[in-house]
Interface confidence: low
């Protein structure tokens, strides 16, 4: 088992490095509908959390240049061309921008206003609008560079419930399930463990960026080579999976503490646990609010 440590550690480092871009870019062509994902999980059906969408990076409070807002019951403010296509009553507050123009390019803020000071989840999503192609555009209207299935559990609630976004149907996606003990470390660190609001975040990392795909092919080849003599077969070279790595690899990576500047995740020592056979979950303490959503879905306490 311990012979896996160096490779597992390197693999986990590489995975984290792949995800550290300051913003996830979502792309659409002029005239298409743009889709910006944002999710949370209501504590109970109908027990909604206010959410706002704004043009521009998330400010300290609220959203700047609000384009859409929900409250505990309904969408109570929206502007033309901006709407929620998903079931916001189930926590899908992904924003659809209709018939985009080049002027729609920029940063958008999705703010999930979780009760409690500094508990808000703030996601900055970068929308890049490309000029329309001369050739006929594909019928699919969601044209963005990264798709993230998401999964979630709350502490003591058993196995995770998984739901997949079908936007890039032929790409296998990496699964890293994590538990966020703290959502942020501001000057006044809000200790969520004290308040009993520990949240497990399931992050599924998508392969979509061209460079990412190229790297994924390389990594896939390495993984294929590494595991070719083991029982597990990698069926898609773009897949990098942690599902069957032994926990010792995580523990080794954990001992080092992996940090990245824009998207800081500190993996704490001796905190992985076995949830299901052949699946290992590392607990991750997010020391700084992620600057991109990573397709996360947050389980409310």
């Amino acid at each position: 088992m311990f012979s896996h440590l160096p490779f597992d550690c390197v693999l986990l480092l590489l995975l984290l490095l792949l995800t550290r871009s300051s913003e996830v870019e979502y792309r659409a062509e002029v005239g298409q509908n743009a889709y910006l994902p944002c999710f949370y999980t209501p504590a109970a059906p109908g027990n909604l959390v206010p959410v706002c969408w704004g043009k521009g990076a998330c400010p300290v409070f609220e959203c700047g240049n609000v384009v859409l807002r929900t409250d505990e019951r309904d969408v109570n403010y929206w502007t033309s061309r901006y709407w929620l296509n998903g079931d916001f009553r189930k926590g899908d507050v992904s924003l659809t921008i209709e018939n985009v123009t080049l002027a729609d390019s920029g940063i958008y803020c999705c703010r999930i206003q979780i009760p409690g000071i500094m508990n808000d989840e703030k996601f900055n999503l970068k929308l890049v609008i490309k000029p329309a192609k001369v050739t006929p555009a594909p019928t699919r209207q969601r044209d963005f560079t990264a798709a993230f299935p998401r999964m979630l559990t709350t502490r003591g609630h058993g196995p995770a419930e998984t739901q997949t976004l079908g936007s890039l149907p032929d790409i296998n996606l990496t699964q890293i399930s994590t538990l966020a003990n703290e959502l942020r470390d501001s000057r006044l660190a809000n200790d969520l463990r004290d308040s009993g609001a520990t949240i497990r975040i399931g992050i599924y990392i998508g392969a979509g960026i061209c460079a990412g795909l190229a790297l994924a092919l390389i990594f896939g080849a390495l993984i294929f080579k590494w595991y070719s003599h083991s029982k597990e077969k990698i069926q898609n070279l773009s897949l990098i999976s942690l599902a069957n790595l032994p926990p010792s690899g995580l523990a080794n990576a954990v001992a080092e503490g992996i940090r990245s500047e824009e998207n800081i995740y500190t993996i704490e020592e001796n905190v992985y646990e076995v949830e299901e056979p052949n699946e290992y979950y590392c607990y991750v303490s997010s020391r700084q609010q992620p600057s991109q959503p990573l397709g996360c879905r947050f389980a409310m306490p």
Epitope: F61, P115, G116
Partner: antibody
Framework: QVQLQESGPGLVKPSETLSLTCTVS??????????WGWIRQPPGKGLEWIGI???????YYNPSLKSRVTISAHTSKSQFSLKLSSVTAADTAVYYC???????????????WGQGTLVTVSS | EIVMTQSPSFLSASVGDRVTITCRAS??????LAWYQQKPGKAPKLLIY???TLESGVPSRFSGSGSGTEFTLTISSLQPEDFATYYC?????????FGPGTKVDIK
């Protein structure tokens, strides 16, 4: 210097709606750096947090009062108001409006308060 | 909701005394705690926020400490103008509950 001034009737009949307004001067009412709230204090007792709202309209209320309370803003007048329905004698109190805020990621509690206005619920 | 308790409820002290007031939260609130001073007929005045940060203009004889569930407000040398009621308030989760208050009287 930020100043807050409560106004409204000092006497309200039981079962009616208590309505108070807080006028803000000397500060940016619509700034995203602040939140605004109401606190009350029954005679001879402690402080009770009623609720707050952020400049863009999001409100948080004390669950014990939530079914009866509404806080709303009148941005153009730099005012925000409190409405408390179906009042009883237990709602008799000095009502304060206040401002809170944030410095970077540090929450600032209510740093500016109005002088308070006594509202008596009696028939 | 988070319940805040303060002890003692009443405190008699003399000018120059060192006074300590304790505030406890029913669950951990990290450092999200503020202290206010209130004099009769007046609105509360913010003394300390973030458990230990002195509000601008507040005399340095006031200090705060603690984290999690137990906090203290200390007045190093009580002055005549310090006789008042002191409230703690948690700002960790809604509603932002106050403690019941500690009245500091002249002995």
């Amino acid at each position: 210097q930020v100043q807050l001034q409560e106004s409204g009737p000092g006497l309200v009949k039981p079962s009616e709606t208590l309505s108070l307004t807080c006028t803000v001067s000397g500060g940016s009412f619509s700034s995203s750096s602040y939140y605004w709230g109401w606190i009350r204090q029954p005679p001879g007792k402690g402080l009770e947090w009623i609720g707050i709202f952020y400049y863009s309209g999001t409100t948080y209320y004390n669950p014990s009062l939530k079914s009866r309370v509404t806080i709303s803003a009148h941005t153009s007048k730099s005012q925000f108001s409190l409405k408390l329905s179906s009042v009883t004698a237990a709602d008799t109190a000095v009502y304060y409006c206040a401002r809170g805020g944030e410095y970077f990621d540090r929450l600032l509690p209510f740093d500016y308060w109005g002088q308070g206005t006594l509202v008596t619920v009696s028939s | 909701e988070i319940v805040m308790t303060q002890s003692p409820s009443f405190l008699s002290a003399s000018v120059g005394d060192r006074v300590t007031i304790t505030c406890r939260a029913s669950q951990g609130i990290s450092s999200y705690l503020a202290w206010y001073q209130q004099k009769p007929g007046k609105a509360p005045k913010l003394l300390i926020y973030a458990a230990s940060t002195l509000e601008s203009g507040v005399p340095s004889r006031f200090s705060g400490s603690g984290s999690g569930t137990e906090f203290t407000l200390t007045i190093s040398s009580l002055q005549p103008e310090d006789f008042a009621t002191y409230y703690c308030q948690q700002l960790n989760s809604y509603p932002f509950t106050f403690g019941p208050g500690t009245k500091v009287d002249i002995k």
